[in-house]
Interface confidence: medium
């Protein structure tokens, strides 16, 4: 019985259940293609359990294989908007440390106004993920249209 | 040894591994934009382990953070069909209890005939998820083209 | 203390954390619509922990419910490319053993150059998953544009 109680008292974080779901805060200044994210229960349904935000970018706290997912919807968009402003591309990658910089996931909008995808990838403690949106189109900040998250899957 | 046996006999559900994958049963009557789902091994590869169906809508049985995913393909569809009938939009949300009603995930078809996405979101026991398809286009019932599922990720 | 140590020494595989993320190796000869995959740390960020590759196709080693995900991007593609060569379709299915052959996930490109989706499905030890790309268009081999993976979720 005492063992069972001790089990229950182990913090979830020690089980490696790191997880985060973020909503868009704002886009960067003119020459900065990065999207800036925010998360926390006060903001709605976004949260960070383990990973942290560093100036709007997601920083990983635990080594492991993660499922990374993203959806970005362009604001005030029709298929003609998207095709006229082609190429509008979204890339998710490790942007720091510089030695580990790599693009993990890339999608173009072509004639659509939303991209959504997901992938498994190894990430290490300290890796910062950036989401770069090229082009001049504006992403929607609606929390059901634009979001970005990670889920720790295994060591 | 007895402890190990006791461990093995714990039902999986007690570990919080709630999961469901549903296939489309039918669309609602004229004024009802909801899709009605079905699941179970007798139907093919759909299943419910934990969550339940309530009149074709998915009801959550365990509090936690869930990965929600969906794919909907329009029947007898070409890119011109989709653009002519624009806006055709799919929204996944909590529809009951009314106090927790919120849109979780929203996508428009624009010039495509399939939408697919996924997100992490907190859900509570008793939350019912509805999937609303606006417009007059018909979703495909093929089980490899249209499906909807949830996976419990952590408390 | 001894019990805790024994727990730590259990191989991860025994916990059922089978997972794989693959990158495109090559397409098949003229009459073979299958995509051929490769994985391993020497190749970049792809890996196999549990499942194996059998002549470029993914073979499952553990019974359970899996999250299957895929993204395929067409090479040198614009929305006119995709619509001119319609239908270009990607299907993920169990291709062997023949008795269990079934399509699990199907998407058409229509006017887009990328498809991405995911679903939960039961898979059994020995199931081989094939990814069939119909049509004559060429998939990109960039590792951030085309990938295929599975994640064991529960028994």
């Amino acid at each position: 019985q005492r063992f069972a109680q001790a089990q229950q008292q182990l913090p979830l974080e020690s089980l490696g259940w790191d997880v985060a779901e973020l909503q868009l805060n704002h886009t960067g200044p003119q020459q900065d293609p990065r999207l800036y994210w925010q998360g926390g229960p006060a903001l709605g349904r976004s949260f960070l359990h383990g990973p942290e935000l560093d100036k709007g970018q997601l920083r990983i706290h635990r080594d492991g294989i993660y499922m990374v997912h993203i959806q970005v919807t362009l604001a005030i968009c029709s298929s003609t908007t998207a095709s006229r402003h082609h190429p509008t591309t979204l890339a998710v990658g490790i942007c720091s440390p510089a030695s580990r910089s790599i693009s993990l996931l890339r999608l173009s909008f072509h004639q659509g106004c939303t991209i959504a995808s997901q992938r498994l990838t190894p990430l290490a403690r300290g890796d910062t993920l950036c989401t770069n949106l090229t082009g001049t189109l504006l992403p929607s900040r609606n929390t059901d249209e634009t979001f970005f998250g990670v889920q720790w899957v295994r060591p | 040894q007895r402890f190990a046996q006791a461990q093995q006999q714990l039902p999986l559900e007690s570990l919080g591994w709630d999961v469901a994958e549903l296939q489309l049963n039918h669309t609602g009557p004229q004024q009802d934009p909801r899709l009605y789902w079905q699941g179970g091994p007798a139907l093919g590869r759909s299943f419910l382990h934990g969550p339940e169906l309530d009149k074709g809508q998915l009801r959550i049985h365990r509090d936690g953070i869930y990965m929600v995913h969906i794919q909907v393909t329009l029947a007898i569809c070409s890119s011109t069909t989709a653009s002519r009938h624009h806006p055709t939009t799919l929204a996944v949300g909590i529809c009951s209890p009314a106090s927790r009603s919120i849109s979780l995930l929203r996508l428009s078809f624009h010039q495509g005939c399939t939408i697919a996405s996924q997100r992490l979101t907190p859900l509570a026991r008793g939350d019912t998820l509805c999937t609303n398809l606006t417009g007059t286009l018909l979703p495909s019932r093929n089980t490899d083209e249209t499906f909807f599922g949830v996976q419990w990720v952590r408390p | 203390q001894r019990f805790a140590q024994a727990q730590q020494q259990l191989p991860l595989e025994s916990l059922g954390w089978d997972v794989a993320e693959l990158q495109l190796n090559h397409t098949g000869p003229q009459q073979d619509p299958r995509l051929y995959w490769q994985g391993g740390p020497a190749l970049g960020r792809s890996f196999l922990h549990g499942p194996e590759l059998d002549k470029g196709q993914l073979r499952i080693h553990r019974d359970g419910i899996y999250m299957v995900h895929i993204q395929v991007t067409l090479a040198i593609c614009s929305s006119t490319t995709a619509s001119r060569h319609h239908p270009t379709t990607l299907a993920v299915g169990i291709c062997s053993p023949a008795s269990r052959s079934i399509s699990l996930l199907r998407l058409s490109f229509h006017q887009g150059c990328t498809i991405a989706s995911q679903r939960l499905t039961p898979l059994a030890r020995g199931d081989t998953l094939c990814t069939n790309l119909t049509g004559t268009l060429l998939p990109s081999r960039n590792t951030d544009e085309t990938f295929f993976g599975v994640q064991w979720v529960r028994p």
Partner: nanobody
Amino acid sequence: QLQLVESGGGLVQPGGSLRLSCAVSGRTSSTYAMAWFRQAPGKEREIVAVITWSGGRTAYADSVKGRFTIAKDSAKNTVYLQMNSLKPEDTAVYYCAADSEVSSSSEGQYGYESWGQGTQVTVSS
């Protein structure tokens, strides 16, 4: 690395045709695809067409679709670019390249591990 040698370029009138050849020698087992690029004076190098080494799947830049055809003869280890209905704007140096990746973008040049020296195509009356 592969060795690639292009031939078949020349001067042709608008509306005319040419067939470029690219002879491939070396180990092709790790090659995903063969591509034709072109570079016009003062412009960036751009991709024209690609064919997979194993399966004969193809992709074309919008600017040449319906006019150019890429093909290969595995027995001769040669890749061809048949160019019909040539236009003055097709004037460029055409390069053959062996590719390990192939980008979704027609601007993508990374991943191409071997290049030929190029052959000049001039379309003029």
